[in-house]
Interface confidence: medium
């Protein structure tokens, strides 16, 4: 039950995270800029990965796409790539995890197959989340290191006045959405990986059967039998005998006096 809950919660958290990554990638407000100290008009400029927009106090808003690929900064291209890779991996991870969900029965799919699929989707979610966090962080770093600060081109005019005006860029809403979404996808992926451990069939230590050819009789102690899984009390593997290939539950439910060699 706990495994199913962990897997289901991991799926939901990852789903929300990937939806957030998609939203952040599509959002226009990656960096925002106020034309501060500029009496021309109250204008709010903001830029995304795909286009730039201007919103005026009058309510007029206009956006223009970046129609060039080659002319764009390499860092912007890198951020775009990271976000797209994150979305693609996340989408594939969601698709795989749907079939891996314990609550969904598809034919006669074994638990081991579901465990592998859960692990695969978990790893995909982790990588997806890391891609999104990396992309957003690279962009944020560009803002912090003044890469996106505009140094005005002011020509020496009749007055002989030359000035440099810097345009301040701040973090846009998309950065925070991206960070949170990336984190959620990462957490969801970790939860899926944890769920995978619970889904995998436990390896019982049936191979540790000790055969004695000598005449020494070994007495069977009722109640002392347990198939060693690493979780039982018999962790030192001291003389565990099993005459038949039964599950741990079967052995504990129906102890037999013939369980010795």
């Amino acid at each position: 039950m706990a495994v199913t809950a962990c897997q289901g919660l991991g799926f939901v958290v990852s789903l929300i995270g990937i939806a957030g990554i998609i939203a952040a990638t599509c959002m226009d407000q990656w960096s925002t800029q106020d034309l501060y100290n500029n009496p021309v008009t109250a204008v709010f400029n903001y830029q995304g990965l795909w286009r730039s927009c201007v919103r005026e106090s009058s309510g007029f808003t206009e956006c223009r796409g970046y129609f060039t690929l080659l002319g764009l900064p390499a860092m912007l291209q890198a951020v775009r790539a990271l976000m797209i890779v994150g979305i693609v991996l996340g989408a594939i991870g969601l698709l795989v995890s749907i079939f891996a969900l314990k609550c969904i029965r598809i034919g006669s799919m074994e638990d081991s197959a579901k465990a592998n699929m859960t692990l695969t989707s978990g790893i995909m979610f982790i990588v997806s989340g890391l891609c999104a966090i990396a992309g957003v962080s690279v962009f944020a770093n560009m803002l912090v290191t003044n890469f996106w600060m505009s140094t005005a081109n002011m020509y020496t005019g009749m007055g002989g006045m030359v000035q440099t005006v810097q345009t301040r860029y701040t973090f846009g809403a998309a950065l925070f959405v991206g960070w949170v979404a990336g984190g959620l996808t990462l957490i969801g992926g970790v939860m899926m990986c944890i769920a995978c451990r619970g889904l995998a069939p436990e390896e019982t230590n049936y191979k540790a059967v000790s055969y004695h050819a000598s005449g020494h009789s070994v007495a069977y102690k009722p109640g002392g039998f347990k198939a060693s899984t690493g979780f039982g009390s018999n962790t030192k593997n001291k003389k565990i005998y099993d005459g038949g290939a039964r599950t741990e539950d079967e052995v504990q439910s129906y102890p037999s006096k013939h369980d010795y060699v």
Partner: nanobody, 121 residues
């Protein structure tokens, strides 16, 4: 690179009118806000009037009711119609624009070389 070229300046009598033009040329992707500034000899450069891409306008108190700013987005040109000119309007008039540069993904604040307006009898 975006260049701004002002024209229309000259000598005019007090009470007269002038129309200044500012044309943007070069690698223009988008020019958002445009404005006029002036600088009288020995004084600081001051804001005169401004217009946004959407047509929102703003004026300095000293020129309100007398000056009118307009813009033709298709031609990337801005105009300043100056009426009822006074001697204190004598100055170099500079064109200013916020131009979006897609190559660097940033705004460039561009200034023109200026045009001289002299109001004298």
């Amino acid at each position: 690179q975006v260049q701004l070229v002002e024209s229309g300046g000259g000598l005019v009598q007090p009470g007269g009118s002038l129309r200044l033009s500012c044309a943007a040329s070069g690698n223009i992707f988008r020019i958002d806000t445009m404005g006029w500034y002036r600088q009288a000899p020995g004084k600081q450069r001051e804001f005169v009037a401004g217009i946004s891409r959407g047509g929102s306008t703003n004026y300095a108190h000293s020129v309100k009711e007398r000056f009118t700013i307009s813009r033709d987005n298709a031609k990337n040109t801005m105009y300043l119609q100056m009426n009822s000119l006074k001697s204190e309007d004598t100055a170099g008039y500079y064109c200013n624009a916020q131009a979006w540069d897609p190559g660097t993904i940033r705004y460039l604040e561009v200034w023109g070389q200026g045009t001289l307006v002299t109001v004298s009898s």
